[in-house]
């Protein structure tokens, strides 16, 4: 991941705003604060982005290399099956859950985990780089 201009001025890492990190054609924001799932989603939308939707195992692996043990909200919910916010199914990874009330998804360096949507966690936003 290539850090944005707040952290680096390298010519090879342009085009993501301050606070954001670049990977491929996308910019990622890793929060410091914690919010519940819906508030994390609203934060991302208010910054013209989306709560993280992961497209494949490669992207997931790369992001997990950057994450710690702390879980971060992603744009994943259990609505008659685990689906990303754009409606696409989760089909490249399993998600660990130990309760039917855990209907929102979070990620850390090791796994995708279901959690109660009211829990306050850090989150990750994603948007197409300018």
């Amino acid at each position: 991941l290539c850090q944005g201009s707040k952290y680096s001025t390298c010519a090879s890492c342009p085009s993501c705003p301050d606070h954001w990190m670049k990977y491929g054609n996308h910019c990622y924001y890793f929060s410091v604060e914690k919010k519940d799932w819906i508030s994390s989603l609203e934060f991302c939308l208010a910054r013209d982005s989306h709560l993280l939707m992961i497209t494949d195992k490669q992207e997931m692996s790369l992001l997990q290399d950057f994450l710690s043990e702390a879980f971060h909200w992603v744009g994943l919910r259990n609505n008659s099956g685990w689906r990303w916010e754009d409606g696409s199914p989760l089909n490249f990874s399993r998600i660990y859950s130990n309760s039917l009330v855990q209907t929102c998804g979070a990620i850390n360096k090791n796994s995708l985990q279901a959690s109660s949507c009211e829990v306050s966690l850090q989150w990750v936003c994603k948007k197409v780089s300018p």
């Epitope: 705003p17 301050d18 606070h19 929060s31 410091v32 604060e33 914690k34 919010k35 519940d36 819906i38 508030s39 609203e42 934060f43 939308l45 208010a46 910054r47 013209d48 009211e118 306050s120």
Partner: antibody, heavy 119, light 107 residues
């Protein structure tokens, strides 16, 4: 320094309309989500609307949805609140506020503009 | 919605006093709490964010603590310019909600 200056408040009859404006300066307006907060003697401080950096996304609490519309013009560094079908309970001081980038709610507030809904 | 209950609603104190204001959330909000100061006829000004971090330019006599559901704003030695109304705000869960305010008056 960050400055937010509201205008457009006044006396309006129930059912009427009003458009509030907020002129922003001292920061890169297009890089911040913005909100309106109102304050009444009865209900205290209450969030009423948020708009994304580009203006493509709006968010409202249920009690104002459909009556209040937030918008912005990044070329003019301006934020707006269109208020329709006004009710007596909309009487308040309305503040234009900047959202803290890291998600810690609002960091800077304007001085406010007063809206009075009365017949 | 999360309810924020502030206490006391008002208090009288003298210059130099130590003042403590508390805010209780109806459910766990972690450390997602701000404190604002509002003087008569003015706008709220953020003093503290994320429970305990002071905004730039805010005197060090102001401090915040707590986590989960119980939070405290402390003014270690009250000054004349501190007589105002103080509000807490939670931003862990949408919609953002404020406490009803604590008015700090001169004894």
């Amino acid at each position: 320094q960050v400055q937010l200056v509201e205008s457009g408040g006044g006396l309006v009859k129930p059912g009427g309309s009003l458009r509030l404006s907020c002129a922003a300066s001292g920061f890169t307006f297009r890089n911040y989500a913005m909100s309106w907060i109102r304050q009444t003697p009865g209900k205290g401080l209450e969030w009423v609307a948020t708009i994304s950096e580009s203006g493509n996304y709006n968010n409202y609490p249920d009690n104002v949805k459909g009556r209040l519309t937030i918008s912005r013009d990044n070329a003019k560094n301006s934020l707006y609140l269109q208020m329709n079908s006004l009710k007596a309970e909309d009487t308040a001081v309305y503040y234009c506020v900047r959202d803290d980038w890291e998600g810690r709610a609002m960091d800077y507030w304007g001085q406010g503009t007063t809206v009075t809904v009365s017949s | 919605d999360i309810q924020m209950t502030q206490s006391p609603s008002s208090l009288s104190a003298s210059v130099g006093d130590r003042v403590t204001i508390t805010c209780r959330a109806s459910r766990d909000i972690g450390s997602s709490l701000n404190w604002y100061q509002q003087k008569p006829g003015g706008a709220p000004k953020r003093l503290i964010y994320a429970t305990s971090s002071l905004d730039s330019g805010v005197p060090k006599r102001f401090s915040g603590s707590g986590s989960g559901t119980d939070f405290t704003l402390t003014i270690s030695s009250l000054q004349s310019e501190d007589f105002a109304t103080y509000y807490c705000l939670q931003y862990a869960s949408s919609p953002w909600t404020f406490g009803q305010g604590t008015k700090v008056e001169i004894k």
